[in-house]
């Protein structure tokens, strides 16, 4: 129940999170033109990863997208490589994900698929989360690095009089959005590989009984465990209890994790 | 075609408040601010403040702040401006300006102070 | 707030003249947004309310002569009215359409002389 219960928090924060990412990408906040020098300013400048905007005293809001690919800077091609990757992943992690829930019955689906299913659309949602963060910190990074420029140069082209104040932008809605929905991706990814744990199959735990053959004693048990107290020679190089997934063979060769109480 | 149809004269003494009202039509009245400009006899024009009628959000001239209450009804696609503690020299043509480039203007609102 | 200077204060010309009216501003009106600059130049007749002429200093607004032209970028503009017709005689205005609070010049009022 607890396993069912995490799985499916894991598919749902993930899907916000997934659902936020892909929110965060397409907004046009990612920059705000920075009120500080100009808190009255009547024309108000954003920008996203695919447009800018501009609000005029009008109330009129005119965004122009950028139509041109070999001239954009590096890092916001990186950044909308990042985020698309983010997306992608968190998509099929998605897809992967509803066939993984332990409540969703599909034909006659191993519980040792479900779990492998489980594991892979986590990482997928780790990574995707990760991909997010990642994207949304690079372009904050690249805002942090030209506000200080633009610092430095803020009254350059003063003629006597005449002020010049150079346009510096700030972080906008979409970064915010972006890493909390990093972080809930991130989360979910977590909570779907914590879930796989505990969806491998687990034997029916049968007590070992002997049974006397003419002239030899030798302990049997359902399932084909070998050395059941897990002391025997073919158990030297493996671990007792493993937290990660396991294939249908190794479910076979390990010990429950009820054998020991 | 977009029109901006504003009250009539108003005559006030000093002290009074004055309530001007304008009725947009031919576009959608929350997609453009509603701008408030006045013009006193051979003066310049003078910018009041405005509003943005989806929100009710204002921004008034710091000359008129605390005298100036810029309202809106949406639902009638009317903007309204009250000009409180009126003194002489706010004898003017007050005028609602809207749309893009603020291109459509009211036909004015002679508001007289006199004693 | 911005100031803005438009000079003449006024002047005298015929028809089919070509005249120029100034306009500075105490503060850039140049947006690096859009590359644009937010100055505004109106048109009053007596008794009348100001008619746009001009807006980002150089685009004509429609139904507008082409006699009618707007250029300048950052604190300098003109305006220019390359043959008079007897209905421009009127006050010019320009306006500050880039920060609050938004401001006009004095006006040019153009006579016939």
């Known amino acids: 129940m607890a396993v069912t219960a995490c799985q499916g928090l894991g598919f749902v924060v993930s899907l916000i999170g997934i659902a936020g990412i892909i929110a965060a990408t397409c907004m046009d906040q990612w920059s705000t033109q920075d009120l500080y020098n100009n808190p009255v300013t009547a024309v108000f400048n954003y920008q996203g990863l695919w447009r800018s905007c501009v609000r005029e005293s009008s109330g009129f809001t005119e965004c122009r997208g950028y139509f041109t690919l070999l001239g954009l800077p590096a890092m916001l091609q990186a950044v909308r490589a990042l985020m698309i990757v983010g997306i992608v992943l968190g998509a099929i992690g998605l897809l992967v994900s509803i066939f993984a829930l332990k409540c969703i019955r599909i034909g006659s689906m191993e519980d040792s698929a479900k779990a492998n299913m489980t594991l892979t659309s986590g990482i997928m949602f780790i990574v995707s989360g990760l991909c997010a963060i990642a994207g949304v910190s690079v372009f904050a990074n690249m805002l942090v690095t030209n506000f200080w420029m633009s610092t430095a140069n803020m009254y350059t082209g003063m003629g006597g009089m005449v002020q010049t104040v150079q346009t510096r932008y700030t972080f906008g809605a979409a970064l915010f959005v972006g890493w909390v929905a990093g972080g809930l991706t991130l989360i979910g990814g977590v909570m779907m590989c914590i879930a796989c744990r505990g969806l491998a199959p687990e034997e029916t735990n049968y007590k070992a009984v002997s049974y006397h053959a003419s002239g030899h004693s030798v302990a049997y048990k359902p399932g084909g465990f070998k050395a059941s107290t897990g002391f025997g020679s073919n158990t030297k190089n493996k671990k007792i209890y493993d937290g990660g997934a396991r294939t249908e063979d190794e479910v076979q060769s390990y010990p429950s994790k009820h054998d020991y109480v | 075609q977009v029109q901006l149809v504003q009250s009539g004269a108003e005559v006030k003494k000093p002290g009074a408040s004055v309530k001007v009202s304008c009725k947009a039509s031919?576009?959608?009245?929350?997609?453009?601010?509603m701008h408030w400009v006045r013009q006193a006899p051979g003066q310049r024009l003078e910018w009041m403040g405005y509003i943005n009628p989806n929100n009710g959000g204002t921004s008034y001239n710091q000359k008129f702040q605390g005298r100036v209450t810029i309202t809106v009804d949406t639902s009638a696609s009317t903007a309204y401006m009250e000009l409180s503690s009126l003194r002489s020299e706010d004898t003017a043509v007050y005028y609602c300006?809207?749309?893009?480039?603020?291109?459509?203007w009211g036909q004015g609102t002679t508001v007289t102070v006199s004693s | 707030d911005i100031q803005m200077t438009q000079s003449p204060s006024s002047l005298s010309a015929s028809v089919g003249d070509r005249v120029t009216i100034t306009c500075r501003s105490s503060q850039s009106l140049f947006n690096s947004g859009n590359q644009k600059n937010y100055l505004t130049w109106y048109q009053q007749k007596p008794g009348k309310a100001p008619k746009l002429l001009i807006y980002?200093?150089?685009t004509r607004e429609s139904g507008v002569p082409s006699r009618f032209s707007g250029s300048g970028s950052g604190t300098d503009f003109t305006l220019t009215i390359s043959s008079l017709q007897p209905e421009d005689f009127a006050t010019y205005y320009c306006q500050n359409d880039y920060s609050y609070p938004l401001t006009f010049g004095g006006g040019t009022k153009l006579e016939i002389k």
């Open positions: 300006v809207t749309t893009r480039y603020l291109a459509v």
């Open positions: 980002w200093a150089s």
């Open positions: 031919g576009y959608t009245f929350t997609d453009y601010n």
